[in-house]
């Protein structure tokens, strides 16, 4: 567990008066339809709120939306609906906020049926001013910004045209027709699939994958017989129909589609799916659905090329295509992921990995909790985490697990303690060491958020009754204070804090309800006076991540290196501040066989760390296609785990084999590829 002085809960001094002086109410004069909230830029304090009240099949005078702007983190709002000419804004497109601190915003308006095209309102000054632009098409999707240049936008039209703007939506050009899906890649590249015959649905599995690197001046066909494609980290994936039957396979490219390799993954049939669960520049977590309507599949982890995959976890819960999976990247500690498995008896259990999918284990039982009715042995059980699947099943779980990169080691989640996830009302648990150990933090379901890089945790009880109390902790959830933020309770709908968990402001959203009137209301609480002083050196202590055995020289080694962090002491009540940067000291570890995965044609027998040749492949031409060409694959049977930084130690060298292979992929070989210019 992370360091913390075990002491009696001390009350934060005079906190009621301090918070009362920093609580700001805003009542919105709106019928309670829907509300959406967007932060514009980082550390700007600018929030846009769009309220809409819309009844289908009612003339436009009745559809109402209002736009509000705050520039002080939600303490005060100004009605700026007149800046968009009191136009009704389409909520299904949301507010398209530009990347980084571009200050750009695009709102898509509702237009009458007979119009030639849609209408957008554009701002490039953090929503201080808007320009109305009539479009030459009706948008089907929200405007998508290029990650590299926020002046470049793309959108699909209702007639499946791909439209691009080079001047932040001022002028639009249709660069291709019959487009199903389009995505920005790196360097302002656009990838998109096209259909030739009937429609996207009819041509599924016969789509072509195209690329343009110059915003539509020229194109290159980089794939045929495409079912779908996806981008993850530096990898471009395509699922491709097989020649002979209705199965499809994943192909991967690391050079923007110029060359492709067939991923060493099982093929899937019509009713199955692939899903990229997580990806970075090193590797990919890929889910492959089981045949039949099982609700589970297998997680595979890739090598650095995205080609060779190791089986990571069996019976991984993932309901249907685009359905629910509990797979969660714990962003507060490197290498940690949490997900759920469906066991043979159809119960759902939580598993955690601390080494990027190398090994999975159950979550340790919290010391202050009893095993529930699902446990066969009342002394031995695990913590099971509620995530997306529980939420989709309408269990009493208001929030998914929460972690933040700058709140090192902290994970907060709803859970139950037993042999499997329970349908009983869950409690809230916290880990301060990235998921190794857990403590019950709050009784019953709550909404929660992290402020000031972990210096404050805020929670609100999940209740069907109106609420007026907020809870907060300055010691990573050990002790809690309660603050009544309003005399008149409100129907609570959500907590909002600036993304990145650096802010000290929290907004409580809800609505008041009186006779035939319900109005949106927000309360923004600034905790700056609770954390009176800036943190100093003495407020921090050294913490070794992934530490399980302090006596061991290799303690804390994960993926070839260990990291020491400076962590805020639990007893310190001070501000990390908006400019807080996580201080960490990495040190390289010696290599062991655990730092290597088995290369293509090799596997690890159970309870053995050595890679041995797969018997069924001995003496066979391998169905393996590297870069779309027949060639020799040279391997020593081992490959360094992606992102592993170990040095020295074990160096698993064995005879280098030439694996003569036959390329059975029918995927584009370079000579089949064609280019064209507009």
């Amino acid at each position: 567990s992370a360091p913390g002085e075990d002491e009696e809960c001390g009350r934060v001094r005079d906190f009621v008066a301090k918070l009362a002086n920093n609580t700001h109410q805003h009542v919105f004069d709106d019928l309670r339809g829907s509300v959406s909230l967007s932060w514009v830029g980082d550390s700007t304090g600018v929030i846009l709120v769009l309220t809409t009240f819309h009844v289908p099949l009612v003339i436009m005078t009745f559809g109402q939306s209002k736009l509000y702007r705050s520039e002080d983190y939600g303490k005060n709002f100004k009605d700026i609906t007149d800046l968009i000419n009191n136009t009704f804004i389409r909520t299904e497109f949301g507010m398209a906020i530009g990347p980084e601190n571009s200050g750009k915003v695009v709102l898509t308006a509702e237009v009458s049926g007979g119009s030639r095209g849609g209408r957008i309102f554009r701002s490039s000054d953090f929503a201080k001013n808007f320009v109305q632009t009539d479009l030459p098409f009706h948008p089907l999707t929200q405007m998508m910004y290029s990650p590299q240049n926020s002046d470049y936008l793309l959108a699909l039209s209702t007639e499946n045209g791909l439209w691009v703007s080079k001047n932040f939506g001022g002028k639009w050009e249709e660069i291709h027709k019959a487009v199903c899906l389009a995505k920005w890649g790196s360097d302002n590249t656009i990838f998109f699939t096209t259909y030739a015959n009937g429609s996207c649905k009819a041509d599924l599995g016969a789509l072509e994958l195209w690329r343009t690197s110059d915003l539509g001046k020229s194109f290159k066909t980089i794939g045929v017989k495409i079912y779908s494609f996806g981008l993850g980290g530096r990898f471009l994936f395509a699922s491709v129909m097989a020649d002979k039957d209705t199965t499809r396979r994943i192909h991967v490219s690391t050079d923007q589609g110029d060359t492709w390799s067939m991923a060493q993954l099982p093929s899937v049939g019509q009713e199955q799916f692939y899903s990229i669960l997580a990806a970075n520049d090193d590797m990919v977590f890929m889910h492959v659905d089981e045949p039949g309507d099982t609700g589970f599949g297998t997680i595979f982890t890739s090598d650095d090329r995205g080609i060779v995959y190791s089986k990571s976890l069996d019976r991984h819960l993932y309901t249907t295509t685009g359905g629910e999976t509990d797979f969660t990247n714990v962003t507060s500690l490197r290498g940690v992921y949490i997900t759920s498995v469906l066991s043979e008896d159809n119960s759902i259990q939580t598993m955690i990995t601390f080494d990027q999918g190398g090994r999975w284990t159950h979550l340790r039982k919290p010391e202050n909790s009893e095993c529930d009715a699902t446990a066969k042995n009342k002394n031995e059980c695990s913590l099971h985490i509620h995530a997306s699947y529980s939420i989709s099943q309408k269990l009493n779980v208001p929030m998914a697990p929460l972690s933040e990169p700058n709140a090192v080691g902290i994970v907060i989640a709803h859970g139950s303690v037993g042999d499997a996830i329970s349908v009983m009302v869950p409690d809230v648990y916290i880990s301060d060491d990235g998921g190794y150990s857990w403590t019950k933090m709050l009784e019953g379901p709550h909404y929660y958020t992290i402020l000031d890089s972990g210096g404050i945790i805020v929670a609100i009880e999940h209740s069907s009754r109106p609420i007026n109390v907020i809870k907060f902790s300055t010691d990573e959830g050990q002790c809690w204070q309660t603050y009544t933020f309003t005399r008149d309770p409100i129907y609570f709908t959500g907590l909002a804090s600036e993304p990145g968990a650096r802010s000290m402001n929290i907004s409580i959203w809800g609505f008041t309800e009186s006779f035939l009137t319900s109005q949106w209301v927000s309360y923004t609480i600034d905790f700056k006076d609770i954390l009176e002083r800036n943190c100093e050196e003495k407020d921090y202590t050294i913490w070794l991540a992934h530490s399980t055995d302090p006596e061991d020289y290799e303690d804390g080694c994960i993926l070839g290196y260990k990291e020491q962090f400076l962590r805020l002491r639990k007893s310190s009540v001070c501000q990390n501040g908006r400019d807080y940067v996580v201080t960490k000291q990495p040190s390289i570890c010696l290599c062991s066989l655990e730092d290597f995965l088995c290369d293509f044609g090799y596997y690890r027998p159970e309870n053995d760390s050595k890679c041995v040749e797969q018997p069924e492949l001995k003496g066979h031409d391998l169905e393996f296609c590297l870069y779309g060409r027949e060639e020799h694959l040279t391997t020593n049977g081992y490959r360094k785990i992606p992102g592993d930084k170990c040095q020295g130690g074990v160096n698993p060298v064995r005879e280098v084999k030439d694996l003569k292979k036959k390329c059975t992929s029918n995927f584009l070989s370079p000579e089949k590829q064609n280019s064209k210019s507009n």
Partner: antibody, heavy 124, light 108 residues
């Protein structure tokens, strides 16, 4: 398109409790924009508002009926219900459920969707 | 309670006639007023909301005006399908909602 359908017994004995249910189809009762009302109409007479419920469970009743009325909501079934206790012959009427769109500080948006109505007779 | 007084209680008119129905509130109700049409054996149908806004799908020969205490429903050119009873309804800031007594539009 949202539709409302009343259901319940057509005949109730005096002093008993009248129970009706309104089933909402084509939309969610949990939409925070609407108020779910009961209105009745005595034979050959005008319309009388009984009360409404908000999805959160808060209710408002006509003061003239308040002591006898209970309106409840079951969001999981997409239904809301009316109970009127200690009925007499004066409660014989056509009972309608309706969706009320509420009001702002300036405007009232009216009851835009109604059930077809169910006739309840109070008689021994 | 706010009382809604509707007049006339009945009116006889011919196809093509202009028909005006008035509704008076016992105290000011801003634009918290709606108009409904009801045919025998049927549920009421919303015609006008917020005193003057035409509900979607309602013919433009129907119009509403007024605010405060005095409101008017006008049918500019009566059609055969318009013979029905018309009700005004107010929605105040405190309960109850009340309806006017109704105006029956009959064939002359």
């Amino acid at each position: 398109q949202v539709q409302l359908q009343e259901s319940g017994p057509g005949l109730v004995k005096p002093s008993q409790t009248l129970s009706l249910t309104c089933t909402v189809s084509g939309g969610s009762i949990s939409s925070g924009t609407y108020y779910w009302s009961w209105i009745r109409q005595h034979p050959g007479k005008g319309l009388e508002w009984i009360g409404y419920i908000y999805y959160s469970g808060s209710t408002y009743y006509n003061p003239s009926l308040k002591s006898r009325v209970t309106i409840s909501v079951d969001t999981s079934k997409n239904q809301f219900s009316l109970k009127l206790s200690s009925v007499t012959a004066a409660d014989t009427a056509v009972y309608y459920c309706a969706r009320d769109r509420g009001r702002t500080e300036s405007y009232y948006y009216g009851m835009d969707v109604w059930g077809q109505g169910t006739t309840v007779t109070v008689s021994s | 309670d706010i009382q809604m007084t509707q007049s006339p209680s009945s009116v006889s008119a011919s196809v093509g006639d202009r028909v005006t129905i008035t509704c008076r509130a016992s105290q000011g109700i801003s634009s918290w007023l709606a108009w409904y049409q009801q045919k025998p054996g049927k549920a009421p149908k919303l015609l006008i909301y917020a005193a003057s806004n035409l509900q979607s799908g309602v013919p433009s020969r129907f119009s509403g005006s007024g605010s405060g205490t005095d409101f008017t429903l006008t049918i500019s050119s009566l059609q055969p399908e318009d013979f029905a009873t018309y009700y005004c309804q107010q929605a105040p800031s405190v309960p109850p909602i009340t309806f006017g007594g109704g105006t029956k539009v009959e064939i002359k």
